[in-house]
């Protein structure tokens, strides 16, 4: 499967949509900045094999999809952009799932990177907790939007892994 190119293109489209989704000036939200601790150190220090990279990226996109599929998210963003963004993420998930089947076979699932998947889940838990604490305020969503954009562009090592042959 030609994942690197497809994923890169969809990722860029998703990031463009995410960038367009902003409703208020970020300049007014500086005091709401928060340390979510994206697990970049763990990712940077690891050479991902293709199946590993696929499953960790899948988890990141799945968690992002879940985050932006909530009722609170629907109230925060312009509906048509949110729908386009969610569709783009959904397509990415389908691409990754198709690739997993092709790479490791339908029965096999890569278990060696449970730690990475757990780190991603904890990261998104911190984001969800922050939104709850901030009562899903417009600035809180703006901070989360900036953080998601940053984490998407951070996952360079994962994307390198997509180009590897297992």
């Amino acid at each position: 499967c030609d994942l690197p190119q497809t994923h890169s293109l969809r990722n860029r489209r998703a990031l463009i949509l995410l960038a367009q989704m902003g409703r208020i000036s970020p300049f007014s939200c500086l005091k709401d900045r928060h340390e979510f601790r994206f697990p970049e150190e763990e990712f940077d220090g690891h050479q991902f094999q293709k199946t590993q990279a696929i499953s960790v990226l899948h988890e990141m996109i799945q968690q992002t999809f879940n985050l932006f599929s909530t009722e609170d998210s629907s109230a925060a963003w312009e509906q048509s952009l949110l729908e386009k963004f969610s569709t783009e993420l959904y397509q990415q998930l389908n691409d990754l799932e198709a690739c997993v089947i092709q790479e490791v076979g339908v029965e096999e699932t890569p278990l060696m990177n449970e730690d990475f998947i757990l780190a991603v889940r904890k990261y998104f838990q911190r984001i969800t907790l922050y939104l709850m604490e901030k009562k899903y305020s417009p600035c809180a969503w703006e901070v989360v939007r900036a953080e998601i954009m940053r984490s998407f562009s951070f996952s360079t090592n994962l994307k390198k892994g997509l180009r590897r042959k297992d």
Epitope: G22, P26, F27, R33, E142, A146, E147, R150
Partner: antibody, heavy 121, light 107 residues
């Protein structure tokens, strides 16, 4: 390698206009804001204003509002600082620096080398 | 605007000395406080961000502390290359503002 490269030194007369530039490279230009800082001879740092190159949203310090214009051209990864009518008191070193916006990352971690503007009759 | 007041304005110290510079904000800025070092003819260099995070590549003898309105930059053992001017800057709200600077000179 992240770099902010500023345009060269300028010598101008009072009343003249001027536009200095700051070109970013080695990073996604639209993912960071660009701030401008003034330093008059022998004095401290003064924050002038900031721009989000992704949509050109701009904010100024009250001291500089109406005195200068900050702009950006994301297609060439360049931010600008301009004056329509220079005064002798605009003589200073001007620095640009990048800011990570709302991301939890170092503020103003990379700076341009500075552009010296001299206004004298 | 938030006013930032640094003290002292200048100080004389010897190599090996422990140096402390303080910065006070006119209102609470949480931990949104940065410290910069500037040498003559050079652009400022970020040392500490978010009050206590050491910028990559900055020696560990530099440390920052504080939150709210009172902040401190400490150089645990002054080195010859540390003689410079130090500035604090708040990034809690726009407009960002700098302290007036502290010049660290050789005794």
């Amino acid at each position: 390698e992240v770099q902010l490269v500023q345009s060269g030194a300028e010598v101008k007369k009072p009343g003249e206009s001027l536009k200095i530039s700051c070109k970013g490279s080695g990073y996604s230009f639209t993912s960071y804001w660009i701030g401008w800082v003034r330093q008059m001879p022998g004095k401290g740092l003064e924050w002038m204003g900031i721009i989000d190159p992704s949509d050109s949203d701009t904010r100024y310090s009250p001291s500089f509002q109406g005195q200068v214009t900050i702009s950006a051209d994301k297609s060439i990864s360049t931010a600008y600082l301009q004056w329509s009518s220079l005064k002798a008191s605009d003589t200073a070193m001007y620095y640009c620096a990048r800011h990570p916006g709302l991301a939890w990352a170092p503020d103003f971690d990379y700076w341009g080398q500075g552009t010296l503007v001299t206004v004298s009759s | 605007d938030i006013q930032m007041t640094q003290s002292p304005s200048s100080l004389s110290a010897s190599v090996g000395d422990r140096v402390t510079i303080t910065c006070r904000a006119s209102q609470s800025i949480s931990k949104f406080l940065n410290w910069y070092q500037q040498k003559p003819g050079k652009a400022p260099k970020l040392l500490i961000y978010f009050a206590s995070s050491l910028q990559s590549g900055v020696p560990s003898r530099f440390s920052g502390s504080g939150s709210g309105t009172d902040f401190t930059l400490t150089i645990s053992s002054l080195q010859p290359e540390d003689f410079a001017t130090y500035y604090c800057q708040q990034s809690n709200t726009l407009p960002f503002t700098f302290g007036q600077g502290t010049k660290v000179e050789i005794k």
